[in-house]
């Protein structure tokens, strides 16, 4: 008895396709070993047609694939464009040779069945409507016209010209004639369901002189489109239901037991499981819309359906589209924290993954808002300036080439709590969702800047110090000047970090920044932060105002300031007078600069593919230095 299981018999029709699922026992070896599909010959040999190692035979070229789903312990063989030559005995199996664990599958491909020559076939999708054409001779023009549906024993009336209508067709069936043509009548049936499928007879007149026509109505449920997505990636369901439902409410639901549970609709309903990671976007007035889900989880796999109805809920006899979503746990998207916690007044550094093959793509960070259909306004991007209300406290640091960019938000308030998306204008699968939780601070912040009310005097020297605890001792400290294009890191010289330390005095760890001489361009936000390599940590922000010197000024005594700066310079051997010119504004502000909303984050066609670097905008350079006081006991 083979532990592999699958369908023993598969039967299909020429030109169609099959999806054969083979199930294997749940072991690590099975999950990773070679999977194959082979055809058994008369000699008992089984010739490989396709395998998970990438082998594809000539006769399957362009029409077959094999996909392993280790999380489900299954693999699927999809074969398209079937011909009668595909009829035969096959094996699906596991192992390095075709003599491993296997299961026998018999595939039979038949010719398309022929209907009697006088039968007219109408093929319609569920929820659509059909207009059946019924020709008749002129002598039957005054006679009764009717359409009936064949059952085993009789032909059950659907509608006739005396306005008799079968109860199950009330409001759905119409019998009419067009213009002055007295040789054809029409029956229109709307909101088709599976129960409407079958053989019909339309008739004009009675007895042997009656005109009859056979009709075969086929009502098809849309075949689910198979979607294979990686864990933590995103999926877009593109739903095109047609102009006739353009003004109806739209929905996406997921099959669950006996119902299809609505996940989101255009009337504001949203499943809490998808909070922060779903958008529904009406595309146009032709009934098209899309639903984007980010941060895919294993439990998101399943059978999805989109549709339209005034209630925003699934309704029989209304058009639908379906998908089967598979979520592959062997994901290329790195596993990162989906919840980031911060405290009021503190900061968070969020590492956003992107496809490393697309290091030049534009990076963005947007805040998901659930009102209406959901939307995600961009707050910052590599070529999108920081939103005004985030001035001085939000920056994006791009680290080209390593597959990660960092977004830092400081001066946190409880209002910042919510869902944020990392996205690029490249590979849309790499959209990720972060939930930011902000708790009330219960202790002093780790980084503190003195003086706190910083006003520098034009032409003089000004120093600010950033105090940090011992736990940050081994990390790199930096100062950067914030602008709405990023936070430009100032050159620093960290002497103390290279000295050996026996102990750490909590009160005396600081990194200082000196402006010498202070110019008007120095006014603005500055950040003090810590990082380890390319991994950013905590930050704190300070606004430095620049004023002209006034008599009786209560500002820091210039002599003291110079002396202090001089100490820093002597100790740190830093040339603090280096000054670089302010970087000019980037001419192309990026795709979301004017319209700052990603109303349809799923529409790649509209996304600009220019590249930029928001983390490297140059401000006027100043110096920062670190001082460490070591106490030997």
């Amino acid at each position: 008895k083979s532990p592999i299981f699958g369908p023993q018999e598969v039967s299909s029709i020429e030109g169609d396709s099959v999806s054969i699922t083979c199930y294997y026992p749940d072991t690590s070896v099975n999950r990773h070993t070679r999977k194959y599909w082979c055809r058994q010959g008369a000699s008992g040999m089984c010739t490989t047609l396709i395998s998970s190692n990438g082998y594809l035979s000539k006769e399957y070229s362009g029409r077959a694939n094999l996909i392993n789903f280790p999380e489900n312990n299954t693999f699927v063989i999809n074969i398209e464009q079937l011909t009668q030559d595909d009829t035969g005995s096959y094996k699906c199996g596991l192992g390095t040779s075709n003599r491993g664990l296997s299961f026998d599958v018999s595939l039979e491909v038949s010719q398309v069945p022929e209907l009697p020559s006088d039968t007219h076939v109408y093929t319609k999708d569920i929820g659509r409507n059909v207009t059946i054409e019924c020709p008749f001779k002129r002598e039957n023009a005054p006679s009764k016209k009717s359409l009936c549906k064949k059952t085993n024993q009789s032909c059950e009336l659907v509608i006739d010209s005396t306005e008799k209508v079968n109860p199950s067709y009330i409001g759905r069936a119409k019998l009419f004639m067009k213009g002055t043509d007295l040789t054809v009548f029409y029956v229109n049936i709307s909101h088709l369901t599976h129960n409407d499928a079958g053989l019909y007879i339309c008739q004009a007149g009675e007895g042997p002189s009656a005109d009859k026509k056979n009709v075969d109505l086929q009502v098809l449920a849309p075949e689910p489109e198979l979607l294979y997505k990686d864990l933590r990636s995103s999926v877009t369901f593109e739903c095109d239901l047609g102009r006739e439902v353009a003004n109806e409410a739209k929905y996406l639901c997921r099959m669950n037991k006996e119902t299809c549970d609505v996940i989101i609709n255009t009337l504001g309903k949203r499943d809490p499981d998808f909070e922060g990671r779903i958008l529904i976007t009406p595309k146009d007035d032709n009934g098209r819309f899309s639903v984007l889900i980010t941060g895919l989880r294993k439990e998101d796999a399943g059978h999805y359906q989109c549709g339209a109805h005034s209630s925003g809920l699934p309704q029989e006899g209304w058009p639908i589209q379906t998908w089967q979503l598979f979520v592959n746990e062997e994901s290329t998207i790195p596993n990162r924290r989906s919840v980031v916690k911060g405290v009021t007044g503190g900061s968070v550094a969020i590492a956003c993954p992107y496809n490393p093959k697309e290091s030049s793509s534009l990076k963005y960070w947007c805040r998901w808002e659930g009102d209406g259909n959901g939307h995600c306004p961009v707050l910052v991007g590599t070529q999108a300036q920081v939103q005004e209300e985030y001035e001085g406290r939000l920056a994006l640091f791009d680290q080209p080439g390593n597959g990660t960019y960092t977004v830092i938000l400081n001066q946190l308030t409880t209002e910042d709590a919510g869902f944020y998306w990392c996205l690029t204008n490249g590979d849309s699968r790499w959209r990720t969702t972060i939930e930011l939780q902000v708790a009330e601070a219960t202790r002093e912040p780790n980084l503190e800047v003195t003086p706190q009310n910083a006003t520098a005097v034009l032409g003089e020297t000004f120093t600010v110090s950033c105090h940090y605890p011992c736990k940050f001792y081994s990390q790199e400290k930096y100062w950067c000047k914030w602008s709405n294009k990023g936070c430009h890191i100032l050159p620093s010289h960290d002497e103390g970090a290279r000295q050996s330390s026996v102990s750490c005095d909590q009160s005396s760890q600081l990194v200082s920044m000196t402006l010498n001489p202070v110019s008007k361009e120095d006014e603005g936000w500055y950040w003090c932060g810590v990082k380890q390599g390319q991994t950013y940590g905590e930050t704190t922000a300070i606004y430095i105002a620049v004023e002209e010197r006034t008599r009786g000024s209560s500002h820091v005594n210039p002599t003291d300031a110079n002396a202090r700066a001089k100490v820093a310079l002597e100790e740190e051997v830093v040339d603090s007078s280096i000054s670089e010119k302010e970087n000019k504004a980037i001419p192309n502000p990026g795709p979301f600069a004017n319209e700052r909303e990603i109303q349809n984050v799923g529409d790649q066609a509209q996304e600009n593919r220019a590249s930029g670097d928001a983390g490297s905008a140059d401000g006027q350079s100043r110096s920062s230095s670190s001082k460490h006081h070591h106490h030997h006991h």
Partner: nanobody, 129 residues
Framework: EVQLVESGGGLVQPGGSLRLSCAAS????????MGWFRQAPGEEREFVSA???????????YYTDTVKGRFTISRDNAETTVHLQMNSLKPEDTAVYYC???????????????????WGQGTLVTVSS
């Protein structure tokens, strides 16, 4: 809502045949799986056979090892009915046979009870001399 009604059960001698039918009414799907499970007295319910189909007319038939070659599952296209033709019956085939339906098409494991959303009340098959 889908209702499933089984019929065709009864008493048969070893080596004999029976044909079980399962009629589905209410909301029906053009792409779904219908299966047969059985439960012998004091035993757990076990998978017997299943048939999946898609609206393009492709069929997938599944059988458990113990009935392979003796039982045949089929679907009546016009009526939404599935039949299980049981030949060469053995005393160990005695059980209550349940019909089940799933609207998930050809994707879930047809042997797993949790793949099926709708269940019939069951029909008793007794194989005894």
């Amino acid at each position: 809502e889908v209702q499933l009604v089984e019929s065709g059960g009864g008493l048969v001698q070893p080596g004999g045949s029976l044909r079980l039918s399962c009629a589905a009414s209410g909301r029906t799907f053009s792409s779904y799986t219908m299966g047969w499970f059985r439960q012998a007295p004091g035993e757990e319910r076990e998978f017997v056979s299943a048939i999946s189909w898609s609206s393009d007319g492709t069929y997938y038939k599944y059988y458990t090892d113990t009935v392979k070659g003796r039982f045949t599952i089929s679907r009546d296209n016009a009526e939404t009915t599935v039949h299980l033709q049981m030949n060469s019956l053995k005393p160990e085939d005695t059980a209550v046979y349940y019909c089940a339906a799933s609207s998930s098409g050809t994707y879930g494991d047809p042997r797993s009870e949790r793949e099926y959303r709708y269940w019939g009340q069951g029909t008793l098959v007794t194989v005894s001399s």
